[in-house]
């Protein structure tokens, strides 16, 4: 008995469907045993679906009832499953196990990793610190959603809408602006991006003199 998944990693967008491939080969014609899919996480493992060759009955894990379909060719050699309505909770490693009582090797398995893709949500831009000349401030940018985790980059524009270089690396967040001055004034755009999307937010920086600090 041999079991294989044709891909190590699968990527699929949230809300869509994905087929996790699994095929098995055996010389046994009298099939008695199981096909089982488990979801393996560091914190726990849970059953996705179990199919009994003899009773032809399925058992579905709670989170997968009405959302998982086993291949129509399960009795032949195709143990693949399709998961519908993907959510972020479906991220993880899935293990396909096939056991046949009359096969010498009895049980074999293979794995596939599922990465559910979600474009970044519109990031929140905010300023930490007082916008007073001479102060240091931090510009933060964060997307609540995004898979894979979004990458953040910054661009800066002066009052004349001309892009200007940033004195520190433009990627990552937060962006630290030291000893701010009127030269720092303008607006800053944070771009949050991953493999499936891009979103941005902007912040206006207008340093005021210390005398205006109340």
């Amino acid at each position: 008995l041999t079991v294989e998944t044709t891909q190590d990693i699968l990527r699929a967008a949230r809300g869509r469907s994905v087929t996790l491939p699994c095929t098995y080969n055996t010389y046994v014609s009298d099939r008695e045993g199981f096909i089982q899919w488990d979801k393996l996480l560091r914190s726990q493992t849970e059953r996705v679906v179990t199919w009994n060759f003899v009773t032809k009955k399925y058992i579905y894990g709670n989170r997968y009832e009405n959302r998982v379909r086993v291949s129509n060719d399960a009795e032949l050699s195709n143990a693949s499953i399709t998961i519908d309505q993907l959510t972020m909770d479906d991220n993880g490693t899935y293990e396909c196990s096939v056991s046949l009582m009359s096969d010498q090797d009895v049980n074999a398995k293979s794995r596939v990793r599922l990465l559910v893709l979600v474009p970044p949500s519109k990031p929140d831009c905010s300023i930490q610190g007082e916008m007073v000349i001479g102060n240091n401030i931090q510009l933060t940018c964060h997307s609540a959603e995004g898979s894979p985790s979004p990458q953040y980059s910054w661009k800066s524009y002066n009052a004349q809408n001309q892009q200007r270089p940033l004195t520190q690396p433009v990627s990552g967040e937060p962006l630290l602006l030291k000893n701010i001055s009127t030269e720092t004034a303008g607006y800053y755009i944070c771009t949050s991006s991953n493999d499936v999307g891009i979103e941005s937010c902007n912040i206006t920086v207008a340093p005021r003199p210390p005398s205006m600090n109340i």
């Epitope: 045993g33 096909i35 059953r47 709670n62 293990e95 056991s99």
Partner: antibody, heavy 118, light 107 residues
């Protein structure tokens, strides 16, 4: 035929360590998840730990997390449970059990007694 | 963790009696429920898996039913060798958990 033969139990002082072994035969050991289950004297069964067939996913009961380590050596067809910082409440008969798809815990070892006492 | 509660904790019955043991899960476990029999000084033995499937070699007087949170083990006609302790166990999600056991004694 499938066999699970256990060894390594005994008397140990609180705070001490012990390593249990479970030697498997009669099946392709490397294809199966394996488990440890224990039973305190006069009490019920308590699942202790599980290890995936490839040895990269390990799970533990809260009562032993951080103190016990499950491992396997497929070349030797053996399952292990390293028990550290032992407490009186760890006193129990420990069983290894095979976990098959569809039929979990279908074969069990004979059990080995671990006594934690000063 | 999913809690498993068995009832009764013990029962007295005679040979030939019909015996029913129940098991309740603290949350739905679909049909990932197994029943084991254990005799003193011995390792547990798998009787029923997937709530209602009889393990190979187990007499047909044993049967299981239920899904979701409520499950039942029935022995249709108790035999002398059936006096033992019975445990339910969920295998839906780790940590796998057992019920506290039901001891079936001779009346």
């Amino acid at each position: 035929q499938v066999q699970l033969v256990q060894s390594g139990g005994g008397l140990v002082k609180p705070g001490g360590s012990l390593r249990l072994s479970c030697a498997a035969s009669g099946f392709t050991f490397s294809n199966y998840n394996m488990n440890w289950v224990r039973q305190a004297p006069g009490k019920g069964l308590e699942w202790v730990s599980s290890i995936s067939s490839s040895g990269d996913f390990m799970y533990y009961a809260d009562s032993v997390k951080g103190r016990f380590t499950i491992s396997r050596d497929d070349a030797k067809n053996s399952l292990y449970l390293q028990m550290n910082s032992l407490r009186a409440e760890d006193t129990a008969v420990y069983y290894c059990a095979r976990e098959g798809p569809g039929t979990p815990f279908d074969y069990w070892g004979q059990g080995t007694l671990v006594t934690v006492s000063s | 963790a999913i809690q498993m509660t068995q009832s009764p904790s013990s029962l007295s019955a005679s040979v030939g009696d019909r015996v029913t043991i129940t098991c309740r899960a603290s949350q739905s476990i679909s049909s990932y429920l197994n029943w084991y029999q254990q005799k003193p000084g011995k390792a547990p033995k798998l009787l029923i898996y997937a709530a209602s499937s009889l393990q190979s070699g187990v007499p047909s007087r044993f049967s299981g039913s239920g899904s979701g949170t409520d499950f039942t083990l029935t022995i249709s006609s108790l035999q002398p060798e059936d006096f033992a302790t019975y445990y339910c166990q969920q295998s839906y999600r780790t940590p796998y958990t057992f019920g506290q056991g039901t001891k079936v004694e001779i009346k």
